[in-house]
């Protein structure tokens, strides 16, 4: 039986239950190196409290479909008086990037993942020509995800004294210059996330191999190589190379640009201090608000709700978008499904569209982006589910008594982006991370 | 690739103001950093500002800082801007470019350049 989702076969994947303190291991298509779950373990549970370890998926018991993977074990499980086996349900969702295994929730038998990845998607579009994992747990089994710095068109440029050179590079996955307006950055050859442009000539200096390591609590690498053999003449005879470390910077700031620390003989070391390499929940609520010890700062996106039927409405072009944020409440015109954000096409009103659902709801505030986004829309030709990402802006003197009101600044590849000036993205800082 | 039209230049005394517009067609609008550049005649093209795609960010020159404001209106597929309180040095070909490359201000690094639009400054 082919593997179902070769992309995701080269790597080991992590998933925690920080709940429970478990740590899961996942290879999809072959067996996890750990002897404790035995030779044949496609799921290994790790119980950190205990320090034992179980494989709650075989392997060789695999069954899948395009949206889901199973692996049974033939260890008895009792739900309700039956005897079942215990088992692990992945669901696959498309998503723009290779992702992340998500835990869910575990029953007495069955163990749910949900894993949103270009490798389910039913279009190669967001397929790269080479992507590694991009996140890792750290020690007290805290998520850094750096997904979200991954460009799925275009580079970064690293800040670097030197007149004659541009170092580009992305996050974890090759650079696309499909897109590319006619710049430098279009002689990039295929496959390269780290390119080095030389006037009108430019080099891969640097491919993704390995997933993102953590090597402190605070600090993140990523390797790049030069897989093709064949020595670049200005590189002394040594093979070019690239190492990203990522910081978390030890209080919230904006935003800062990759810089280029080290380099000799093409051997680029590269440091880029970013919030992204703090720990998720630092980052992030799946409420309106963000506050506390842990976040560092006071954020309050509540009062934009809409209360009584009433929507904030923002013109794209051939559409409208109804928007109810950080509440619970029915667009009317969205046919009870469930959306924060409603796409309706004006020259056909019944053509509606849920463009995320506030039950997937994401609130981030990150390298001084305030940004409230929503999953889980409708369906796209791509098998990509809509959604909606919402940038804020802090606007003391925003109209609708301080609200604002969101304004429609683009779509991509079903991704519909607004921004917004609000009173309420003001945010206030505590100082002791 | 992405077709750029500038407009809006012309001569203005210093002090004044003026309003330039940059109407793009062609590929996706969306997925562009957009830039305003300058060149005065006998100097190298500069940097004066830039918006990001997805967030409506902005980045300035210094020497533009608190004069100059750009902004877009994805609606018409445009790109502007707004030069108030000129000086005589801002008189150049002023330019709009895209780029998919994040955290630059080099003009190397944009593509799809226009024609251009002439800015005189004078009395």
């Known amino acids: 039986q082919a593997a179902p989702f070769p992309e995701l076969c080269s790597y080991t994947w992590e998933a925690v239950d920080t709940k429970n303190n478990v740590l899961y291991k996942i290879n999809i298509c072959g067996s996890v190196d750990i002897v404790q779950c035995g030779p044949s373990s496609a799921v290994c549970m790790h119980l950190l409290k205990t320090r034992t370890y179980h494989s709650v998926g075989d392997s060789v018991l695999r069954s899948a479909t395009r949206s889901l993977l199973e692996f049974n074990t033939t260890v008895s499980c009792d739900q309700q008086g039956t005897n079942h086996r215990v088992q692990s349900s992945i669901a696959f969702l498309c998503g723009k990037t290779l992702g992340t295994p998500e835990f869910v929730t575990a029953t007495e038998c069955v163990h749910y993942f949900e894993w949103r990845t270009t490798a389910a998607c039913k279009k190669d579009i967001f397929k790269a020509n080479k992507e590694v994992p991009c996140y890792v747990f750290d020690e007290e089994l805290r998520k850094h995800d750096l997904n979200p710095l991954i460009k799925l068109s275009g580079a970064y440029l690293v800040d670097d004294s030197d007149p004659d050179t541009s170092l580009f590079i992305n996050v974890c996955r090759d650079i696309d210059t499909l897109r590319d307006p006619g710049s430098q950055l279009r002689a990039c050859p295929p496959g390269t996330a780290a390119c080095l442009v030389r006037g009108h000539q430019a080099f891969d200096v640097g491919q993704p191999r390995d997933g993102l390591k953590v090597v402190r609590k605070d600090r993140l690498v990523l390797s790049y190589v030069r897989e093709e053999a064949g020595k670049l003449d200005f590189c002394d005879g040594h093979s070019p190379a690239v190492t990203i470390t990522f910081v978390c910077p030890s209080e919230r700031r904006e935003g800062t640009i990759p810089k280029l620390t080290a380099k000799s003989n093409c051997r680029y070391e590269i440091e880029w201090i970013t919030e992204y390499a703090c720990h998720r929940d630092y980052l992030e609520s799946k409420t309106c608000s963000l506050s506390g010890e842990q976040q560092d700062v006071s954020i309050d996106l509540t009062p934009l709700a809409q209360s009584g039927g009433s929507s904030y409405i923002s013109d794209g072009k051939e559409y409208l978008f109804y928007l109810n944020v950080c509440g619970e409440t029915e667009i009317q015109f969205c046919n009870k499904k469930q959306a924060a954000v409603c796409q309706v096409k004006k020259s056909d009103t019944s053509q509606v569209k849920a463009a995320g659902r506030y039950h997937n709801q994401t609130l981030r505030y990150s390298d001084g982006d305030l940004t409230l986004i929503y999953f889980g829309g409708d369906e796209c030709s791509s098998g990509f589910q809509r959604m909606s990402v919402i940038n804020f802006e802090c606007n003391k003197t925003a109209g609708n008594d301080g609200k604002g009101t969101p304004v429609f600044t683009g779509e991509v590849d079903c991704t519909y982006f607004f921004t917004w000036d609000t009173e309420y993205a003001c945010v206030h800082h505590h100082h002791h991370h | 690739d992405v077709q750029l039209v500038e407009s809006g230049g012309g001569l203005v005394q210093p002090g004044g103001s003026l309003r330039l517009s940059c109407a793009a067609s062609?590929?996706?609008?969306?997925?562009?950093?957009w830039g305003w550049f300058r060149q005065a005649p006998g100097k190298e093209r500069e940097f004066v500002a830039a918006?990001?795609?997805?967030?409506?960010?902005?980045s300035y020159a210094d020497s533009v800082k608190g004069r100059f404001t750009i902004s877009r209106d994805n609606a018409k597929n445009t790109i502007y801007l707004q030069m108030n309180s000129l000086r005589p040095e801002d008189t150049a070909v002023y330019y709009c470019?895209?780029?998919?490359?994040?955290?630059?201000?080099?003009?190397?690094?944009?593509?799809?350049w226009g024609q251009g639009t002439l800015v005189t400054v004078s009395s």
């Open positions: 918006i990001r795609w997805s967030s409506s960010k902005t």
């Open positions: 062609g590929r996706t609008f969306n997925t562009y950093n």
């Open positions: 470019a895209a780029s998919i490359v994040d955290f630059t201000t080099n003009p190397s690094h944009f593509g799809s």
